[in-house]
Interface confidence: medium
């Protein structure tokens, strides 16, 4: 159900009864001549468009009967000046879309008593206006003058939307708001114009920090970027690695994809220890054995886990017969005392 709301306004401006006669040419107060003093009130009937306007009910869009507004000829001010019970313009509220056409009947009637405003007595009729019109919604008044020879009625009319209603038929509703259900003002056609920082049909969706990842970030108010579980960073575009992940990366949260040369659940096991740390000394050959371990193959003359220790070939005292020993890189040399010779001075010259 689409609710719409507007009001047809009819402004009675001036009525002229030149001779003070009724429609049947009788004098309003009886007798044959003036002053007739027609105490004039009006019946207004607003109805759907009819090619031939019938003054008979029903007044499908509304009806109104005014109090006595003047005698014979008179002008009518705007507002409620004449009578507290009468407001000019006369308002006909609409709870449905304005169709753009209408029929209007305005009858000027006479009464002897201000309390007797019966409209059924044809003897009281001064004049009757019937018209049908096309009318678009707008603030501008349409002016009209109805002349019947003895009477003139000047009036104007318009159809305006109620506050917060827009569009050709006043069927577009828009009321500015700034709360949980919307942050917007209204455009000329009733379109919702989101306040800065808001978007969506009802302007309830905050616009997050520019650059905020639309999958992994969100916001409750404009300019924020809150990360969903497993994501981090100013724009929530960095995944959070598996806790304890050391030399790994992630494409999705809680991954630990090891960098080259690393292994294990936390990528903390060095698979290329030889290259990264060069632990073997003195020209030894390094071999990775996995899980962050290695072995060094020492060159002759060196020992130790990292070949960091030079082998002392004189340690076992190889030289005989009191010869002195000199340690060389991969061997030793014996300096023989007089009378001895040989590799370890084991031979006697004697």
């Amino acid at each position: 159900q689409v609710w719409s709301s507007g009001v047809f306004e009819l402004k009675l401006q001036e009525f002229v009864n030149k001779k003070g006669l009724l429609g049947n040419r009788n004098c309003c107060r009886g007798g044959s001549g003036p002053p007739c003093a027609c105490r004039t009130f009006f019946r207004v009937c607003l109805k759907h468009y009819q090619a031939s306007v019938s003054p008979e009910p029903p007044c499908t869009y509304g009806s109104a009967v005014t109090p006595v507004l003047g005698v014979d000829s008179f002008s009518l001010p705007d507002g409620a000046g004449i009578d507290p019970a009468f407001s000019n313009p006369i308002r006909f509220p609409f709870g449905f879309t304005w169709p753009g056409t209408f029929s209007l009947i305005i009858e000027a009637l006479h009464t002897d008593s201000p309390d007797d405003l019966a409209t059924e007595n044809p003897e009281r009729l001064i004049s009757r206006l019937t018209t049908q019109r096309h009318l678009t919604v707008g603030e501008e008044w349409s002016q009209d003058l109805h002349s019947s020879g003895r009477t003139d009625l000047r009036y104007s009319y318009r159809f305006v939307c109620d506050e917060h209603y827009y569009g050709e038929g006043c069927s577009v509703f828009c009321r500015p708001r700034d709360d949980a259900f919307g942050h917007f003002t209204c455009g000329d056609r009733g379109e919702k114009m989101c306040d800065p920082g808001w978007k969506g049909q009802y302007c309830t969706d905050p616009i997050c920090l520019p650059g905020c990842d639309d999958q992994h970030g969100y916001c409750d108010k404009p300019g924020e970027c809150k990360c969903r579980v497993g994501w981090q960073g100013r724009y929530c575009d960095e995944c959070i690695r598996y806790p304890g992940c050391l030399h790994g990366t992630c494409q999705q949260p809680w991954q630990c994809n090891c960098q080259e040369g690393w292994g294990g659940l936390f990528c903390n096991q060095d698979l290329n220890y030889c290259t990264h740390h060069k632990p073997c000394r003195n020209g030894a050959t390094c071999t990775n054995t996995g899980q962050g371990s290695y072995t060094c193959s020492c060159r002759p003359g060196y020992t130790g886990a990292n070949c960091e220790l030079e082998v002392d070939e004189c340690a076992p005292s190889p030289c005989k017969n009191g010869a002195s020993c000199t340690d060389l890189e991969d061997s030793f040399s014996c300096t023989c005392p007089p009378g001895f010779y040989g590799k370890v001075c084991e031979l006697s010259a004697m």
Partner: antibody, heavy 123, light 107 residues
């Protein structure tokens, strides 16, 4: 005088349905939001959902989304809460309340409330 | 959803006492906070809207203050008819949420 009158409460079995009405009078129905708020026995207030009768825009709490539907008939100045697939935890007094929204005041509050209608979901 | 946490959950006071109830929002809600009073078996009544504006017809002993995340309802001089449960409510972000309530009892 502004008045909101709820009706339609009662005892219903789990899985059943019930329709609550909220008849409004004394104000222009289409100029306000109408909200439904419930209160389980001995508990606090919980917002159920709301409607803007002028354009039919609705919003719901996650706990009732897909089960409850709010509507309004502007010719009768009445809002409705259609409750389907009812559960024991839906047992509560259901209030309808009027909310004026005014861009000058963030958080205008619910200024008129109905007397409430009790909904009991039990087998 | 935004959580509204009221403290204390209950308090005992005497007629004439100054009573303060606080409400903390889990995130910034500007001044979009209303306070309600509820008596047993009755519907809530609006006391304060937009954090600090006294609703029409509410006695001036009630006042509200705060913005952002911290809000306060103060009753300057407690009267016998003020013994009730008080709720705060935010309407800054959907869905609107209420505090759990503060019961003010006679000491």
């Amino acid at each position: 005088e502004v008045q909101l009158v709820e009706s339609g409460g009662g005892l219903v079995q789990p899985g059943g349905s019930l329709r609550l009405s909220c008849a409004a009078s004394g104000f222009t129905f289409t100029s306000y939001d109408i909200h439904w708020v419930r209160q389980a026995p001995g508990k606090g207030l919980e917002w159920v959902g709301g409607i803007s009768p002028a354009d039919g825009d609705t919003d719901y709490a996650n706990s009732v989304k897909g089960r409850f539907t709010i509507s309004a008939d502007t010719s009768k100045n009445t809002a409705y809460l259609q409750m389907n697939s009812l559960r024991a935890e839906d047992t509560a007094v259901y209030y309808c309340a009027r909310n004026d929204y005014d861009v000058r005041f963030v958080g205008s509050g619910m200024d008129y409330w109905g007397q409430g209608t009790l909904v009991t979901v039990s087998s | 959803d935004i959580q509204m946490t009221q403290s204390p959950s209950s308090l005992s006071a005497s007629v004439g006492d100054r009573v303060t109830i606080t409400c903390r929002a889990s995130q910034d809600v500007s001044t979009a906070v209303a306070w309600y009073q509820q008596k047993p078996g009755k519907a809530p009544k609006l006391l304060i809207y937009s954090a600090s504006f006294l609703y029409s017809g509410v006695p001036s002993r009630f006042s509200g203050s705060g913005s952002g995340t911290d809000f306060t309802l103060t009753i300057s001089s407690l009267q016998p008819e003020d013994f009730a449960t008080y709720y705060c409510q935010q309407s800054f972000t959907a869905p609107p949420t209420f505090g759990q309530g503060t019961k003010v009892e006679i000491k």
